[in-house]
Interface confidence: low
């Protein structure tokens, strides 16, 4: 079965620059299929733009200005690239690649889409590092004791643009765990978002990872934020006691990553 | 030119209660086209659900049913037992691939229908409230409440900033919420929640430690380790790529 990956979740450009959006095809030979590109402008319908067929023929949608979009494919890397020249405000959109995939039964085909790349146009001069800056929160003792479960929270701040994907995994597993997240929020010229994962008591002694995909991650790779295992077998309850007021009973440890 | 028009812009559905989405074709007979349905979820992922001739995407056949009403020139998609996973924007799209004669292999899309999922009506449930802290950051975690209306207050005299709470459906079909803020006096911040004409405080749920061994941090990278009131780490952790440390005893 064909699968499409768009490695860039967003691409930020200044006006009149050129944007190159990539689509990696797997599970099917790129030179044996047609790749289609669609765009979804804010508030508009998803619209076909251009396709490149198995024999290299390029077909553009009528009404699309010539010279605006260029599509090609590189069989060696199984990649199709959509090039958008002279980007302008009306190019702000999410761009999807797609292909027809044959189902088990003859003649039955479905069109599958890549995850999309959002083209962002900015003229802000932003700080050099606008990758997501993580802060981790470990489960409160009260939650682990009372509910036999614990919630990890992963806060990501000071990133730009606003497009970000967060998922959670156990350390040595590729299974994506069911998590919850808040909306992406604007703070001055950058954004913040948080995601949380509640795990049963039996999983608290495992290491968990909050995995973050963002355009400006260092070296373009997903950022992995490690949540250490928790020991839960040593706590006693005293519901009347507000421990945060007991200075003798708190040791605050803050380690902050400030490396480049 | 043909146009696909969804019946509604937004459709609120309740968990477990069947829902129907409709999409009518303007300017052409729907029988001349194949109809497709897609779902776009958070993060823009476009997932194929259904194509005419009984083709379903992986995992959709049991909970979705596609149909065409030739007489009314519309396409129908039924969600048989909605769950919180079914929240998203649903798009109808058409093509003529494989119909013979003049065909188009491009999809023509309609506008999306936003499906919002709400928990089923159920007995009211009081939330549990927990506070999590790291440096100046404080998170108030509010778990398993119903109905949705809630006010979350992080109580502090030295607020730096606060963010709107995130309220989501919990896996059990109630609501969870998190409110985040930054405070100069994060140590003393508590959380109080107004729900169903009652106030619930995080202090109602607090516990006392007898031991020093709750958090067992491992070597981490690219993280800020938590400042936890009530937790006594056994030792200062030597962490790679960390070059700033503050200790408050």
């Amino acid at each position: 079965a064909g699968h499409l990956e768009q490695p860039q979740i967003s691409s930020t450009k200044t006006l009149s620059k050129t944007a190159r959006l990539e689509c990696v095809v797997s599970g099917i030979t790129i030179s044996a299929t047609s790749v289609y590109w669609y765009r979804e402008r804010p508030g508009e319908v998803i619209q076909f733009l251009v396709s490149i067929s198995y024999d290299g023929t390029v077909r553009k949608e009528s009404g699309i200005p010539s010279g605006k979009f260029e599509v090609d494919r590189i069989p060696e890397t199984s990649t199709s690239t959509l090039t958008i020249h002279n980007v302008e405000k009306q190019d702000i959109a999410t761009y999807y690649c797609a292909l027809w995939e044959a189902q088990q039964e003859l003649g039955k085909k479905i069109k599958v889409f890549g995850p999309g790349t959002k083209l962002i146009i900015t003229d802000k001069q932003l700080d050099a590092d606008v990758s997501p800056k993580p802060t981790i929160f470990l489960p409160s003792i009260a939650e682990t004791k009372l509910q036999k479960a614990g919630t990890y929270l992963c806060l990501l701040e000071k990133f730009f643009p606003d497009v970000i994907k967060i998922h959670w995994q156990e350390k040595k597993s590729n299974t994506i765990l069911g998590s919850q997240e808040g909306n992406t929020m604007k703070t001055n010229d950058t954004y913040m978002k948080f995601s949380w994962l509640t795990v049963p008591e039996k999983s608290l002694d495992k290491e968990h990872r909050c995995i973050v995909r963002h355009e400006n991650n260092k070296n373009g790779v997903d950022q992995e934020i490690i949540f250490p295992p928790i020991k839960t077998d040593v706590i006693t309850m005293d519901p009347k006691d507000n421990c945060s007021k007991d200075a003798n009973d708190t040791l605050l440890l803050q380690l902050t990553n400030t490396s480049a | 030119a043909i146009e696909l028009v969804p019946e509604h812009q937004t459709v609120p559905v309740s968990i477990g209660v069947p829902a129907t989405l409709r999409c009518s074709m303007k300017g052409e007979a729907i029988g001349n086209y194949y109809i497709n349905w897609y779902r776009k979820t958070q993060g823009n992922t476009m997932t194929f659900i259904y194509r005419e001739k009984d083709i379903y995407g992986p995992g959709f056949k049991d909970n979705f049913q596609g149909d065409i009403d030739i007489a009314k020139n519309l396409a129908v998609l039924k969600i048989l037992a909605p769950s919180e996973r079914d929240e998203g924007s649903y798009y109808c799209a058409c093509d003529t691939l494989g119909m013979g004669g003049e065909y188009t292999d491009k999809l023509i899309f309609g506008k999306g229908t936003r499906v919002t999922v709400e928990p089923r009506s159920q007995p009211h449930t009081k939330p549990s409230v927990f506070v999590m802290k790291n440096g100046t950051n404080v998170a108030c975690l509010v778990k398993e409440f119903y109905p949705k209306d809630i006010r979350i207050n992080l109580v502090s005299s030295k607020k730096i900033t606060e963010f709107d709470p995130a309220i989501v459906i919990s896996p059990s079909g109630k609501y969870n919420a998190v409110k985040l803020g930054k405070y100069e006096d994060s140590n003393s911040v508590t959380c109080s929640v107004q729900h169903d004409n009652k106030t619930v405080h995080s202090t109602d749920f607090e516990v006392k430690t007898d031991s020093t061994d709750h958090v067992k941090p491992k070597e981490t990278e690219n993280t800020k380790q938590p400042s936890k009131s009530c937790h006594k780490p056994k030792a200062i952790v030597h962490t790679e790529k960390v070059n700033m440390m503050s200790l408050t005893v």
């Epitope: 006006l15 402008r41 804010p42 508030g43 405000k89 009306q90 702000i92 962002i120 146009i121 900015t122 003229d123 802000k124 001069q125 929020m185 604007k186 010229d189 | -």
Partner: antibody, heavy 124, light 112 residues
């Protein structure tokens, strides 16, 4: 499509206040800056101030500081402009304006979409 | 405040002929981020203003290509290369480099 719908015309006495509303539809309200601009009869355009609802902190032109209050209600996607101590020279059409949905949300200065205008007449 | 001065005050033109409006700012409109936040708006009789050009020369979507903007620093020009009847109205330049946002006094384009 983004639309801004303003409240109806007002006739006010000198010294009183007027509050004009501007309801946004068709897009995220929070992140886009709403500007208030006025135009006296036969005159040009004058920027009074603006607000990004997410932040809730307005920016005012010095000329109107102390007399104008700009607010936003996120729950109803509505921005408000209240002008107090009205005098006859405040007779004008008051417009709200904001970027369209194609604009990144920090284009404070963009005024792609305009309300229909609210006529405020100050007369004794 | 930055003062925006437009000339001429009024511009009577023949249909199909070009028109040119000038706008001068009291100080440079080059922002510290390198951009020049100079826009042109059109206001037809009885209507709210409408954005035509942003950042000196970028045409807003849906604006006919007979409208063009040029200039730099403190001197800017809006050109209509063949005036049509629907172009009648008042044209304003506006700066957003500095608070408060300020507008030119307007130039009335009318048909001879």
């Amino acid at each position: 499509e983004v639309q801004l719908v303003q409240s109806g015309a007002e006739v006010k006495k000198p010294g009183s206040s007027v509050k004009v509303s501007c309801k946004a539809s068709g897009d995220t309200f929070n992140n886009y800056a709403i500007s208030w601009v006025r135009q006296a009869p036969g005159q040009g355009l004058e920027w009074m101030g603006g607000i990004i609802p997410f932040f809730g902190t307005p920016d005012y032109a010095q000329k109107f500081q102390g007399r104008v209050t700009i607010t936003a209600d996120k729950s109803t996607s509505t921005a408000y402009m209240e002008l107090s101590g009205l005098r006859s020279e405040d007779t004008a059409v008051y417009y709200c304006a904001r970027p369209g949905s194609g604009s990144p949300d920090y284009y404070y200065y963009d005024m792609d979409v305009w309300g229909q205008g609210t006529t405020v007449t100050v007369s004794s | 405040d930055i003062v925006m001065t437009q000339t001429p005050l009024s511009s009577p033109v023949t249909l199909g002929q070009p028109a040119s409006i000038s706008c001068r700012s009291s100080q440079s409109l080059v922002h510290s981020d390198g951009n020049t936040y100079l826009s042109w708006l059109q206001q037809r009789p009885g209507q709210p203003p409408r954005l035509l050009i942003y950042k000196i020369s970028n045409r807003f979507s849906g604006v006919p290509d007979r409208f063009s903007g040029s200039g730099a620093g403190t001197d800017f020009t809006l050109k209509i290369n063949r005036v049509e009847a629907e172009d009648v109205g008042v044209y304003y330049c506006m700066q957003a480099t500095q608070f408060p946002l300020t507008f030119g006094g307007g130039t009335k384009v009318e048909i001879k």
